[in-house]
Each structure stands twice: as structure tokens, then as C-alpha cells.
């Protein structure tokens, strides 16, 4: 009778992460008597995947009923495959021995390769807000994909950006990979409604590329412009002075009126109006009793926007 051969018909198998891998193995004879074991890798450091005789292997099921006397199919299924499962799997026949079974013959091996989708890209911007004309950096990260080949593009409001640097790690062979990209974006005053998008394309993606977004509203600070104007003199010697605070973002703003350098009133922007570009306008007024002053009055509108150093605009009120 011919000596037993262990046949692994598949040289290689490709499986998607999360799916089940079937590793096929048949023996050509029932003799010698003894169990089958599956290993990942060869040599002394090989990893036991399944032992017909003993042990608990929750992810592994056999294709056939191995308890049947005449069974020669030793194929297994491994569930919920991850990239970490990649490697060469060997079906090994052991001969019954005492005290231990003896390795008799190994199959040629089946190389299991795993394809895994990239995670949804996460885009993060700078920790602190920046003002128009400044360049800010955004990062995009996606993890866990295989194979290594991946494309990443950056867009601002649908326009592709070119000033970015991308790295895929690790550089050498690995079970899965990560991508990290940093893009530089120049802010403009109109960017409150703008979006920065990182787009990742990979062989495993059946839909459009995966996208991660960042709203520039979380990054930009548009400082206000101030204008102080004097309204016509009202009855009882009262003058209405207004401070127009225009085109600022975000809304967080505190205004202080000073009369000749002395604090007259402080208020916080509340009923603001929003411009089309997402910035805000606000107006504050001050009633000044002219008769209470002998000399000219210097009125100052002082604005502290989003925790930044105060900016101010003054107006000289003539007392005639």
C-alpha cells in the first residue's frame, strides 16, 4: 500500500477580514493511525491552530466529522479572520505513539493572506485657533488596512490640495498598515463655512473612497473690525455713540466702553446677526450726558474677542 500523503490543494487563500477562512487538507490513507494537527508556521516556533485529539479552539471548526472512522478530510474553517491571522498553515499527520504521538507527514502548506479595509479617516486640526492669512496643519489617520497600497487625497471645499505629506507605516512587511498625512491650509476670511476633507481609497472599498472631514469653523478666528460713530444730539444734552463690531468669528466677544479711560459699561455679545460667510456683526451703543462734562470726552470702544488681547477704537466727543 502507498505511504500516506497529506494533500493541501490550495497553495494560497485570500480572505477578507471578518470572514471565515477554509483551509483544505486530505490524507490519502487511513494508515498510520493517529491525529491531525494544524500549525501556523514551521519549525520549533510554530503555533498550534488545531489539535484533533485535545484542546479548545473556539475559532476553528472542522469541515468533516473527524470522529468517523474512515474520514480522510481534515479541512478546517477559521472564523472571524483578522490581518494578524496571515501566514502559512500546515496540516500535519501524527502517528500514534507512546507516550507521545510522533509527527509523521506534513502538507505543503497553505498561505493565508488577508485583505482588510481601512478604518474611517479621522481628521484633526490645530489645538489653537488661527487667523486668516495664516497656514494651519491638519492631520488625517486611517488604520488596519491590508494590502499596503492606498491613496489619500486632501480637499478644501471640493478643491484638491497639493501641499501635504503622507506616510504609510510600517515601511516593511506587516499584517496591516496605517496611513498618516499632514496637509497645510492657508486660511481666508471666508473660511468659517469651509471644510477640509481627507479621502482614502483602497482595493477593499466597494463604495466611494472613505472620507474624514474637519470644519474650519473650529480652527479659524476672524478678528472684528470696529467703527465708532456719533449719532445726532438728542434731547436733554444726550449723545448716542455706537460701536459697530463687524465680521468676527467665533461669537465669544466682550465689549467695554471707556469714558476718558474710565470704565463706563461692559457687555457680552448676545443678539448678534450672522453674515452669509458665517461671521457675525454686533452693535453696542452708549448714551453720553454731555452736560455732565466740562471738557471734550474721549470715548473708547474696547473689544476682547475670543480671549485675545483687546482691540479698541476711540472717538472724541466735542463738548461746546
Amino acid at each position: 500500500e502507498e505511504e500516506l500523503q497529506v494533500i493541501q490543494p490550495d497553495k494560497s487563500v485570500l480572505v477578507a477580514a471578518g470572514e471565515t477562512a477554509t483551509l483544505r487538507c486530505t490524507a490519502t490513507s487511513l494508515i498510520p493511525v493517529g491525529p491531525i494537527q494544524w500549525f501556523r508556521g514551521a519549525g520549533p516556533g510554530r503555533e498550534l491552530i488545531y489539535n484533533q485529539k485535545e484542546g479548545h479552539f473556539p475559532r476553528v471548526t472542522t469541515v468533516s466529522d473527524l470522529t468517523k472512522r474512515n474520514n480522510m478530510d481534515f479541512s478546517i474553517r477559521i472564523g472571524n479572520i483578522t490581518p494578524a491571522d496571515a501566514g502559512t498553515y500546515y496540516c500535519v499527520k501524527f502517528r500514534k505513539g507512546s507516550p507521545d504521538d510522533v509527527e509523521f507527514k506534513s502538507g505543503a502548506g497553505t498561505e493565508l493572506s488577508v485583505r482588510a479595509k481601512p478604518s474611517a479617516p479621522v481628521v484633526s486640526g490645530p489645538a489653537a485657533r488661527a487667523t486668516p492669512q495664516h497656514t494651519v496643519s491638519f492631520t488625517c489617520e486611517s488604520h488596519g488596512f491590508s494590502p499596503r497600497d492606498i491613496t489619500l487625497k486632501w480637499f478644501k471645499n471640493g478643491n484638491e490640495l497639493s501641499d501635504f505629506q503622507t506616510n504609510v507605516d510600517p515601511v516593511g512587511e506587516s499584517v496591516s498598515y496605517s496611513i498618516h498625512s499632514t496637509a497645510k491650509v492657508v486660511l481666508t476670511r471666508e473660511d468659517v463655512h469651509s471644510q477640509v476633507i481627507c479621502e482614502v481609497a483602497h482595493v477593499t472599498l466597494q463604495g466611494d473612497p472613505l472620507r474624514g472631514t474637519a470644519n474650519l469653523s473650529e480652527t479659524i478666528r476672524v478678528p472684528p473690525t470696529l467703527e465708532v460713530t456719533q449719532q445726532p444730539v438728542r434731547a436733554e444734552n444726550q449723545v448716542n455713540v455706537t460701536c459697530q463690531v463687524r465680521k468676527f468669528y467665533p461669537q465669544r466677544l466682550q465689549l467695554t466702553w471707556l469714558e476718558n479711560g474710565n470704565v463706563s459699561r461692559t457687555e457680552t455679545a448676545s443678539t448678534v446677526t450672522e453674515n452669509k460667510d458665517g461671521t457675525y456683526n454686533w452693535m453696542s451703543w452708549l448714551l453720553v450726558n454731555v452736560s455732565a462734562h466740562r471738557d471734550d470726552v474721549k470715548l473708547t470702544c474696547q473689544v476682547e474677542h475670543d480671549g485675545q488681547p483687546a482691540v479698541s477704537k476711540s472717538h472724541d466727543l466735542k463738548v461746546s
Epitope: 494560497s12 480572505v15 477578507a16 481609497a201 466597494q206
Partner: antibody
């Protein structure tokens, strides 16, 4: 799992023609689908794909000559202004479950003849 | 665009022969290469994907190898039903476009 093309016929140059690919056994919202053609006695040529979410992508030579769209169970290929050069058997195909780099399910094809 | 050059364009062989068809890409496509078999009046059938993986139901006499720019389809022992035209097809991960080789017709000697 099955794909069947329809709409192939004898058409006049310049008169638009729409081919359909009807799918069964799977959902078009889960797979990338492609259109290909093969002129008589010639090789296979890629026309374009439509993603699972419905975005079309075309071969560089297409230049607006074809439009790919889909509904829940059919994928269409509109030939916008066909010429005699567009005479071919048109195939639809589905990409494999492991990735978009190969096509594992093909329809039998439908013949389009453009002639005056 | 990537060009795929298949060779030979045709070959004559006998049943039992070992047949090798090659495909060369004009630039690296890594392992994104598929092989199809097509018979007259029929749709292409997938044989090999990702350069070396045998599609389910395809006889093990078919095998694929290669990566980068050079790829090979081997039929270890030609059978009567294998007489057909074979196409390679690439996918480029940057352009996300597909290109076919011009085909190899395998005829009976």
C-alpha cells in the same frame, strides 16, 4: 447570482442607445459594477464602473460618450452618440467580494450593431 | 494609462502540454492582476485573481504568479476544454482604472 444584459440592437449612428444589466441574487448597493465591450474578433475593453453608492468612474478614452447609472436592481449604460466604431458585444460584470481589482461574475453579453 | 502586453498572441499545443502565457505591465501594478478564459460567443470567466489566487471552482492545473510588472499564467497539463482565449487584466490602485491585455489564443496543435 446572475447578471443579464439587455437592450442590444441595430442602431443608427448618432442615435442614443441604453443598455441595461439586471442583477439577481445580490444587492447593487453592496458591489462595484462594471461595463466592458468587445468588438467582433477583438479583445476586451473597459468602459467604466459604478460604485456601490452610485458614483460612476470612466476609462480615460470615454470622454462623455457613455453614461453609467443604476437603480436598485439594474445598471444602465447610455451610449450618447454612437458611431460604427461602437459596434460590439457589451458585457456587465460584478467585482469580487474581496476587492475591486477583479470581476468574478459576468453577464452573457448583448450585441450592439451601429450602422447606417 | 497602463499598457498590458500579453505574449504570445497565439499558441498551438497538444493535450497534456504545459502552457505558459505572460503578461507585462508598463508600470508596477503590485499584485493587482487577474486572468480570464473566454470561449467564442461566451462571457469571460475568472481563473486567477490578485496574481496568484485560484478562483473557486477553477481546476488546480491553472496557476498564476508574478508581481510588479511581470506575470505568468500556467496550465500544467492542457485539457481539451482549455482551448480558448486568455486575457490578463490589471487594476491600478492610484488611477483606479482597469486595462486588459490583447489576449492569447490557445489552439489545438
Amino acid at each position: 447570482v446572475q447578471l443579464v444584459e439587455s437592450g442590444g440592437r441595430l442602431g443608427q449612428p448618432g442615435t442614443s442607445l441604453t443598455l441595461s444589466c439586471t442583477v439577481s441574487g445580490f444587492s447593487l448597493s453592496s458591489y462595484v459594477m462594471g461595463w466592458f465591450r468587445q468588438a467582433p474578433g477583438k479583445g476586451l475593453e473597459y468602459i467604466g464602473i459604478i460604485s456601490s453608492s452610485g458614483s460612476p468612474y470612466y476609462a480615460s478614452w470615454v470622454n462623455g460618450r457613455f453614461t453609467i447609472s443604476k437603480t436598485s436592481t439594474t445598471m444602465d449604460l447610455k451610449m450618447n452618440s454612437p458611431t460604427t466604431e461602437d459596434t460590439a458585444t457589451y458585457f456587465c460584470a460584478r467585482v469580487g467580494p474581496l476587492g475591486v481589482d477583479y470581476f468574478n461574475i459576468w453577464g452573457p453579453g448583448t450585441l450592439v450593431t451601429v450602422s447606417s | 494609462d497602463i499598457q498590458m502586453t500579453q505574449s504570445p498572441s497565439s499558441l498551438s499545443a497538444s493535450v497534456g502540454d504545459r502552457v505558459t502565457i505572460t503578461c507585462r505591465a508598463s508600470q508596477s501594478i503590485n499584485s493587482y492582476l487577474a486572468w480570464y478564459q473566454q470561449k467564442p460567443g461566451k462571457a469571460p470567466k475568472l481563473l486567477i485573481y490578485s496574481a496568484s489566487f485560484l478562483y473557486s471552482g477553477v481546476p488546480s492545473r491553472f496557476s498564476g504568479s508574478g508581481s510588479g510588472t511581470d506575470f505568468t499564467l500556467t496550465i500544467s497539463s492542457l485539457q481539451p476544454e482549455d482551448f480558448a482565449t486568455y486575457y490578463c487584466q490589471s487594476w491600478h490602485y492610484i488611477s483606479r482604472s482597469y486595462t486588459f491585455g490583447q489576449g492569447t489564443k490557445v489552439e489545438i496543435k
